[in-house]
């Protein structure tokens, strides 16, 4: 039994049942048609959550693009809707159905007006290029320290086997365009640049094409040549706060660091009536520090809930890396609840939280 590709020209709002896994359907729609793709669960069993992908990018539902677990509808199709569509299991990214969709300029009449561009049903899986591992192509920005090596990859497939070419900032990119040249591995769909320098910065696009279509992916390369420095803290953060007894308070600290920063929140305390030790170092207690499951984002915020008068005082955001430490401090003033009402009536400058 042939696992060949079924050739169809589909009229308006026709629903296309999904191919068996391993097949790729070649579908032609007319401009203005409603493209409907159907991908029933393999073997009729439960399918689980799915995602629809076009040319390697997840489709975002809209008024025109209707996404369901087993069906995709693209209303009022245009030439831009041509491409490689697939339905994938969300968790495993396993491809359940492949469709190669071409939207012709003329509305479809049920006849293949442009048949010479179409593959014959030879029993061979033919079709436009598609990304074979789109879930591994999410890293669009590469920030690379100078002198290191960069590899851009665009793993793809199609039949006939597509060609791959590369552009830099929209122009053809060849080895003679950079000192040190480039290394291409067509079988790995990759471009390698060794020992990058600042002039290598830019947008790099892979173009993968065969006679049935073309897909492209753009990556941005930034080459870092900064000398390492201690963390930089955003000016004005954390900011002084005035809060009402029993309210919630948040202090924010924005940290910039090339090197992995270690962030701590400290509260200044008194020991035996003194704020500093014999050597002049302030007495502090650590309120928040990096833990196994703590993200940098979480560490950039210190939350105090249901504040008491004891919470009033000086708070410090301390950020360190292998180069050194930086710190910014802010004060918390806690007002009694009655005062809040008076102040709010008079000036409106005190807030509860």
């Amino acid at each position: 039994e042939s696992l060949g590709t079924e050739q169809r020209v589909v009229g308006r709002a026709a629903e296309v049942p999904g191919p068996e896994p391993g097949q790729q359907e070649q579908l032609v729609f007319g401009s203005g048609d409603a493209v409907e793709l159907s991908c029933p669960p393999p073997g009729g069993g439960p399918m689980g959550p799915t995602v629809w992908v076009k040319d390697g990018t997840g489709l975002v539902p809209s008024e025109r693009v209707l996404v369901g677990p087993q069906r995709l509808q693209v209303l009022n199709a245009s030439h831009e809707d041509s491409g490689a569509y697939s339905c994938r299991q969300r968790l495993t990214q396993r491809v359940l159905c492949h469709f190669s969709v071409r939207v012709t300029d003329a509305p479809s009449s049920g006849d293949d007006e442009d048949g010479e561009d179409e593959a014959e049903d030879t029993g061979v899986d033919t079709g436009a290029p598609y990304w074979t591992r789109p879930e591994r192509m999410d890293k669009k920005l590469l920030a690379v320290p100078a002198a290191n090596t960069v590899r851009f990859r665009c793993p793809a497939a199609g039949n006939p086997t597509p060609s791959i070419s590369w552009l830099k900032n929209g122009r053809e990119f060849r080895g003679e365009h950079r000192i040190g040249g480039i290394k291409l591995r067509h079988q790995q769909w990759s471009l390698v640049m060794e020992s990058v320098v600042p002039s290598d910065r830019g947008n790099y696009t892979c173009v993968v094409e065969n006679k049935f279509g073309s897909i492209r992916q753009t990556y941005t390369l930034d080459v870092l040549e900064r000398s390492p420095h201690r963390p930089i803290l955003q000016a004005g953060l954390p900011a002084n706060q005035t809060a009402v007894l029993g309210s919630d308070v948040e202090f924010h600290c924005k940290v910039y660091s090339d090197a992995q920063p270690h962030i701590q929140w400290l509260k200044h305390v008194e020991v035996n009536g003194s704020k500093v030790g014999p050597d002049g170092t302030p007495y502090v207690t650590v309120l928040k520090t990096a833990g196994a499951n703590t993200t940098d984002k979480e560490l950039e915020v210190l939350s105090l809930h249901n504040v008491t008068f004891e919470d009033a005082g000086e708070y410090t955001c301390l950020a360190g890396n292998s180069i050194g430490f930086s710190h910014h401090s802010a004060w918390l003033v806690v007002l009694p609840a009655e005062e809040e009402l008076v102040e709010a009536d008079e000036a409106g400058s005190v807030y509860a939280g």
Partner: antibody, heavy 127, light 107 residues
């Protein structure tokens, strides 16, 4: 020309400490990394650990974690391997190697390649 | 840890021979594999990185291939200076691990 020169090896008793140095020249020191690899007499290569010279991050093999510390002085273009609580099985020639990253768009990992190596320094742990 | 197994452990060959050394990873390492050459009493030298990329200055008789778990280093025409021990090494997993080495000796 890239050069790496190790020093600091020698004979040390079990439980003792030693600090190896790796002086580097000929490349932008803080852009890449330094790895330490050892080779016991007549044996194969064993990766010990790595530091990224730009951010000071380090990784270690389980066999040395908690005992060995890799650091660097960027002002001197020198990396160090501080070895504490030494054991007989730590006896080996220790190499430092410049280590650059292959930053890959694929799957968000960085491959590390050791392209220039020092001549090695012998550490013998024996009583 | 990812185990790297080289075969053969040693081989005898003559100048001009085509030599193939294989390296198998205990789990998928994609193309994150390097090959090194080491002569007795000397530091290792990088030959191949990313499974198939020839490092600059390395003669073109050396080539690498493979991805996933199975990799090959080929010397198309063995030269006198190629008699040495060859190591594969992966760096996609932590820790980086080496194969046990393949010694290429003169027949």
């Amino acid at each position: 020309e890239v050069q790496l020169v190790e020093s600091g090896g020698g004979l040390v008793q079990p439980g003792g400490s030693l600090r190896l140095s790796c002086a580097a020249s000929g490349f932008p020191f803080t852009s890449t990394g330094i790895s330490w690899v050892r080779q016991a007499p007549g044996k194969g290569l064993e990766w010990v650990g790595r530091t990224h010279l730009g951010d000071g991050s380090t990784n270690y093999a389980d066999s040395v974690k908690g005992r060995f510390t890799i650091s660097a002085d960027t002002s001197k273009n020198t990396a160090y391997l501080q070895m504490n609580s030494l054991r007989a099985e730590d006896t080996a020639v220790y190499y430092c190697a410049r280590t650059y990253g292959i930053y890959d768009t694929y799957d968000m990992y960085t491959e590390y390649v050791m392209d220039y190596w020092g001549q090695g320094t012998l550490v013998t742990v024996s009583s | 840890d990812i185990q790297m197994t080289q075969s053969p452990s040693s081989l005898s060959a003559s100048v001009g021979d085509r030599v193939t050394i294989t390296c198998r990873a205990s789990q998928d390492v994609d193309t994150s594999l390097a090959w090194y050459k080491q002569k007795p009493g000397k530091a290792p030298k990088l030959l191949i990185y990313s499974a198939s990329f020839l490092y600059s200055g390395v003669p073109s008789r050396f080539s690498g291939s493979g991805s996933g778990t199975d990799f090959t280093l080929t010397i198309s025409s063995l030269q006198p200076e190629d008699f040495a021990t060859y190591y594969c090494q992966q760096s996609t997993g932590h820790p980086q691990t080496f194969g046990q080495g393949t010694k290429v000796e003169i027949k």
